[in-house]
């Protein structure tokens, strides 16, 4: 089975870890695909290791484990993310995460434009 946090949130400009946990007594993971909606983020395979899709190569870092670290988040990154675990002999298992990217707390407080360096 796949276990994951169904809903997560993170701040704009920040980073988030996307993580699915697969558990089985018999099946072994052979490949894991990560997608943002329909768009490929990254793939891991036992044979080949990690490949991050070129579209996301400046913002997606493999790991920890079989998860992904998604950096420099924008509001447009809000949406559904899917992990697909290819296993042998168990078949294919899918997990879903909904990521909500929120305005940074500074923006919400109206301070983003007015921060200054300390005097001295």
């Amino acid at each position: 089975t796949i276990d994951t946090k169904r809903n997560i949130s993170a701040e704009e400009g920040g980073s988030v870890i996307l993580q699915c946990h697969f558990s089985s007594d018999t099946a072994e993971v052979t490949q894991v695909d990560w997608k943002q909606q329909d768009q490929l983020l990254a793939i891991y395979s036992v044979d080949l290791g990690w490949h991050v899709a070129s579209v996301f190569s400046d913002r997606v870092v493999p790991g920890p484990s079989l998860g992904l670290t998604f950096q420099s988040l924008t509001m447009n990154d809000t949406g559904e993310y899917f992990c697909t675990y290819h296993t042998y002999p168990g078949g294919i298992y899918k997990g879903r995460i909904f990521l909500k990217v929120q305005e940074s707390s500074d923006d919400r407080n109206g301070l983003a434009q007015f921060q200054t360096a300390p005097l001295g």
């Epitope: 997608k35 329909d38 768009q39 490929l40 793939i43 044979d47 080949l48 490949h51």
Partner: antibody, heavy 118, light 107 residues
Framework: EVQLLESGGGLVQPGGSLRLSCAAS????????MHWVRQAPGKGLEWVAA????????GYADSVKGRFTISRDNSKNTLYLQMNSLRAEDTAVYYC???????????WGQGTLVTVSS | DIQMTQSPSSLSASVGDRVTITCRAS??????LNWYQQKPGKAPKLLIY???SLQSGVPSRFSGSGSGTDFTLTISSLQPEDFATYYC?????????FGGGTKVEIK
Amino acid sequence: EVQLLESGGGLVQPGGSLRLSCAASGFTFSSYSMHWVRQAPGKGLEWVAAIKSDAGTSGYADSVKGRFTISRDNSKNTLYLQMNSLRAEDTAVYYCARVPYDYWIDYWGQGTLVTVSS
Amino acid sequence: DIQMTQSPSSLSASVGDRVTITCRASQSISSYLNWYQQKPGKAPKLLIYAASSLQSGVPSRFSGSGSGTDFTLTISSLQPEDFATYYCQQSYSTPLTFGGGTKVEIK
């Protein structure tokens, strides 16, 4: 540098047999699924067969099923296509191809021409 | 089998033109769509994988978009070396299938 070098093509009569080879170098052959794709003269690309990295799983186009057999020898870094009961419509350039993650073809060989004619 | 329909089958364009080629799948294939360029007498070359990811070493004037059933390959400013035939290919399920090709010719 990744290289895929096909050989074994040539002229064969209808009903005859041919064995194509693809020698791979420049990468860990045993980690990749490998495919054969063909192209008839002046036509488009047609997928022929595929084999997983460990040789445990293979698949074929309906047009060649039961006549062609894909195999590999990971110790020799070589992919094979045994073609039996050849027909005129099998005439084509045959390419071997590397397919990472079973997703896209990132490297192709230069191709070998198979001509089936009496 | 999943059918891949490419259009147009051929087009004439000039250096510097923006060129768009479309590919339609007979059923949803998510983003399991790749684009290749082939020049006469040569093997195909991967341009775009997973619908929108640019293969390493391919010029940035090439871009891909789409998901589900409708996909597009765009060449933002056609260069002399881009005159070739372009193929889409789905890897959602076997048998893998290719579009019929689009030949880009000099106007």
